[in-house]
């Protein structure tokens, strides 16, 4: 946020940049939270735009019985590993095909025990205020589906009739990590010393970090003909004086008429 200065008063202005503003030879360059010629005004909204998507990662282990373990499987650049990965990925894509949040799988380690597959199931959803619930539900469905497939697709008489067969008892969910996004916390942090006065309001499921000086929200302060200004003690209305009235009161709603004719004051509420 920059405000340009022209003329002789500029040198004076340079030494008067407030709130951490810096002079660049023409104007005060204001830090994020401030604006105005001298960076004297506090912004009324802060961009805390959420990420487009939120991700979750589930650490799972399954045991594949339809492939013989060889040492080559430990080498991620070997043909054995590449072929196993291709088939495992294809199988898991089928298993999780009904989950809209499912992105894919990532094998982290293969070890002996038939083939014990340590892998991550990757989930992603569009950001909405309900993203936690959406991802929690998706992780539950992942658990159900992997449990089902590893119970059904098993070797019978040493024969595997499916793309892959599993050991029913080898299925474990180790850990679930969801990307954290807390707009309230972000808003408070970015508002710094004004954090107590900034709040998050949602519009079209998008969070806005605003102070009461931002118009058009439910917390907006109505200063009538006055101007809302943020200070360390909170939002205040700065009332104006016109040719005919001066205004006062908490919200500048008390107009006092300047009477030139009678020489006394007449109040309007």
């Amino acid at each position: 946020r920059t405000t340009t200065c022209f003329g002789d008063g500029c040198q004076n202005t340079a030494s008067r940049c407030k709130n951490g503003g810096t002079w660049d030879g023409l104007k005060c360059q204001c830090p994020n939270l401030y604006y105005g010629e001298l960076c004297e005004e506090v912004v009324s909204s802060i961009d805390i735009g959420p990420p487009e998507t939120i991700s979750a990662q589930m650490e799972l282990t399954v045991t594949v019985t339809s492939v013989k373990f060889t040492e080559e499987l430990k080498n991620h650049s070997s043909q054995e590993f590449q072929e196993f990965k291709q088939t495992f990925t294809e199988q898991m894509n089928i298993v999780y095909s009904g989950i809209p949040e499912y992105v894919g799988v990532n094998i982290t380690k293969l070890r002996l025990g038939s083939v014990v597959v340590e892998h991550d199931v990757l989930l992603r959803t569009k950001y909405t205020p309900e993203y936690k619930t959406v991802l929690d539900n998706a992780t539950e469905v992942v658990k159900e589906k992997i449990t089902k497939v590893t119970t059904q697709q098993i070797m019978i008489n040493d024969i595997c009739s499916d793309m892959m067969c599993f050991n029913t008892t080898g299925t474990q969910v180790q850990n679930i990590t969801v990307t954290q996004y807390d707009p309230e916390e972000d808003c408070r942090k970015m508002a710094k010393e004004y954090g107590d006065y900034f709040v998050v309001e949602y519009r079209d499921q998008k969070p806005y970090c605003i102070s009461p000086c931002e118009p058009g929200f439910s917390v907006s302060k109505n200063c009538n003909l006055g101007k809302c200004q943020m200070s360390l003690s909170g939002p205040q209305c700065l009332c104006v004086t016109t040719e005919t009235h001066w205004y006062s009161g908490e919200t500048c709603n008390q107009g006092t008429q300047k009477s030139l004719v009678y020489g006394h004051h007449h109040h309007h509420h």
Epitope: S66, K68, F69, E80, E90, C160
Partner: nanobody, 124 residues
């Protein structure tokens, strides 16, 4: 991936014989290998399979007439077809499993790599 190319097809009279070959680009010793066929307007079906340890499996329709074999040294798979009938007319292709696949006793999902086919036409 393993590359597969079938050859040896042709036109033959009913009751005749043909030997199909399948050349593989890599090691087939640790793979299940199989032959599949697809007739016009019909689904692809498994004909014969051989596991890495040499155990063979056949579709009921070809049992006793077809023999599957492999030569690991030559990375080749074969299908000897005797007593051919018009219903054997189809495009024949070979297929391979991933390395170290076990439990191949079906003619279905385990063969994930598929090659170019060769046409077999049996006339009465």
């Amino acid at each position: 991936d393993v590359q597969l190319q079938a050859s040896g097809g042709g036109a033959v009279q009913a009751g005749g014989s043909l030997r199909l070959s399948c050349a593989a680009s890599g090691d087939i010793t640790r793979r299940c290998m199989g032959w599949f066929r697809q007739a016009p307007g019909k689904e692809r079906e498994g004909v014969a399979g051989i596991s890495e340890d040499g155990i063979t499996i056949y579709a009921d329709s070809v049992k006793g007439r077809f023999t599957i074999s492999k030569d690991n040294a030559k990375n080749s798979l074969y299908l000897q077809m005797n007593s051919l009938a018009p219903e054997d007319t189809a495009n024949y292709s070979c297929a391979a499993s991933i390395l170290n696949r076990v439990g191949c006793r079906q003619l279905s999902y385990e063969y994930i790599y598929r090659g170019q086919g060769t046409q077999v036409t049996v006339s009465s």
